[in-house]
C-alpha cells in the first residue's frame, strides 16, 4: 500500500484547491473568528500505528467531504472548484479504504483507540454547530475554510504514522 506519496500529493492538491476557494478577505471576517479546538494535542502525544493513522485520517477526510457536500456548501463556493475539491477528497477516501483492506485483510477491521475517531467527530460537530449558529453566512464559511486548511496541515503525526511499518 503505497499511501504516503499518493496521500501527500492528493493532500497538497486539496489544500491548493481549498486555498483557491477563498472568496472574501479573511480580514473582513475577524469578528466571526472561532476556536474549534482541533485535537492536535491528543494526536501529537501519540505514536500512531499505520492502521490507526489510516482510520483517523479517513474520518477527517470523510467528515470534510460530508461538510462540503451539503446544499449550504454548494451555495457558498464556486461550483467547479468545489467539485474538484470534493473529487480530490473522494479519491483520498478511496486510497485510504483500499489501504485499510490491504493492511488488515478484507474481513478484519483495524484495532485502534476509538477515542481518536470520537475526537475528530466532536471537532466536526463544533464546526457544524458554528455554521448553523452563523446561519451559513459567507464569513462563517470563510472561517471554516481556513480552519479546514489548518487541520489538514496539523495532521503531521498521522502522516508519520502512514510511513510506519506496523
Amino acid at each position: 500500500c503505497d499511501l504516503p506519496q499518493t496521500h501527500s500529493l492528493r493532500n497538497r492538491r486539496a489544500l491548493i484547491l481549498l486555498a483557491q476557494m477563498g472568496r472574501i478577505s479573511p480580514f473582513s471576517c475577524l469578528k466571526d473568528r472561532h476556536e474549534f479546538r482541533f485535537p492536535e494535542e491528543e494526536f501529537d502525544g501519540h505514536q500512531f500505528q499505520k492502521t490507526q493513522a489510516i482510520s483517523v485520517l479517513h474520518e477527517m477526510i470523510q467528515q470534510t467531504f460530508n461538510l462540503f457536500s451539503t446544499e449550504d456548501s454548494s451555495a457558498a463556493w464556486e461550483q467547479s472548484l468545489l467539485e474538484k475539491f470534493s473529487t480530490e477528497l473522494y479519491q483520498q477516501l478511496n486510497d485510504l479504504e483500499a489501504c485499510v483492506i490491504q493492511e488488515v485483510g478484507v474481513e478484519e477491521t483495524p484495532l485502534m483507540n476509538e477515542d481518536f475517531i470520537l475526537a475528530v467527530r466532536k471537532y466536526f460537530q463544533r464546526i457544524t454547530l458554528y455554521l448553523m449558529e452563523k446561519k451559513y453566512s459567507p464569513c462563517a464559511w470563510e472561517v471554516v475554510r481556513a480552519e479546514i486548511m489548518r487541520s489538514f496541515s496539523f495532521s503531521t503525526n498521522l502522516k508519520k504514522g502512514l510511513r510506519r511499518k506496523d
Epitope: S55, H58, E59, N66, L96, E114, L118, F124, Q125, T128
Partner: antibody, heavy 119, light 108 residues
Amino acid sequence: QVQLVQSGAEVKKPGASVKVSCKASGYTFTNYWMHWVRQAPGQGLEWMGEINPSHGRTIYAQKFQGRVTMTRDTSTSTVYMELSSLRSEDTAVYYCARGGLGPAWFAYWGQGTLVTVSS
Amino acid sequence: EIVLTQSPATLSLSPGERATLSCSAGSSVDSSYLYWYQQKPGQAPRLLIYSTSNLASGIPARFSGSGSGTDFTLTISSLEPEDFAVYYCHQWSSYPFTFGQGTKLEIK
C-alpha cells in the same frame, strides 16, 4: 428521503445466534457510520456499537465485545448486526440508527426488529 | 461510562400544563453532545433536541432544552395530547454512548 428498513422478527433458542439486517436508501451509504441500539421490553435504550460502511471499521460497547459482529455489504447498502450466544436477556427490539452531525445524529432510525430468545 | 439518570421516572400531567424533565449525568457532558428523543409505543425514537437546546426539524416550539455540565432539562411549555410519550436523554460525549432510563409522560 433517508430510509432504513430492517429485517423481520426472529425467535431464537438460548445459545444460538441472530443476524439482523438494515438496508439504507436515500443517501450515500458509505458517508455515515451506522449504529445499533437495542431496547428490552418495557426498558430503556442501549447503544451496542457502530460500523463505518466505507471500510467496515467497527466500534463496539464493551458489554457486547466478543458477542457482537457488525458487517456491511456496500453493493446492497446494507449493514448487519450479528449477536451470538443468545440468552433470554437479549430479547429486545434492535434498531439501526444513522450517525451524522448536529441535527443529523440519530435523526434516522430503522423500524426495529424484535428478537425473542426463548427455549 | 457516563450514567444518565432521568427524573421523575413517571410524570402525570394534563394537557395545557407545563412539563419539566430532568437528566443528570454522572460526570460532565459537553452540551454539544447531549440530545433528547421522544418515543411512542411501537415506534422508533424520534430526535427532538440536539446539542442541549436546538430544536430538530419539524419539532414544535413548545419544546425547549437547557442545561450544562451534569444537569440538563427538557421543557414542554404547554402539553398537547400527542406529547404523552417516553422521553430519553442521550450523550455521545464519550464511549460508550449512553441513554437515560427514560421519563414516561402520562395523562393525569
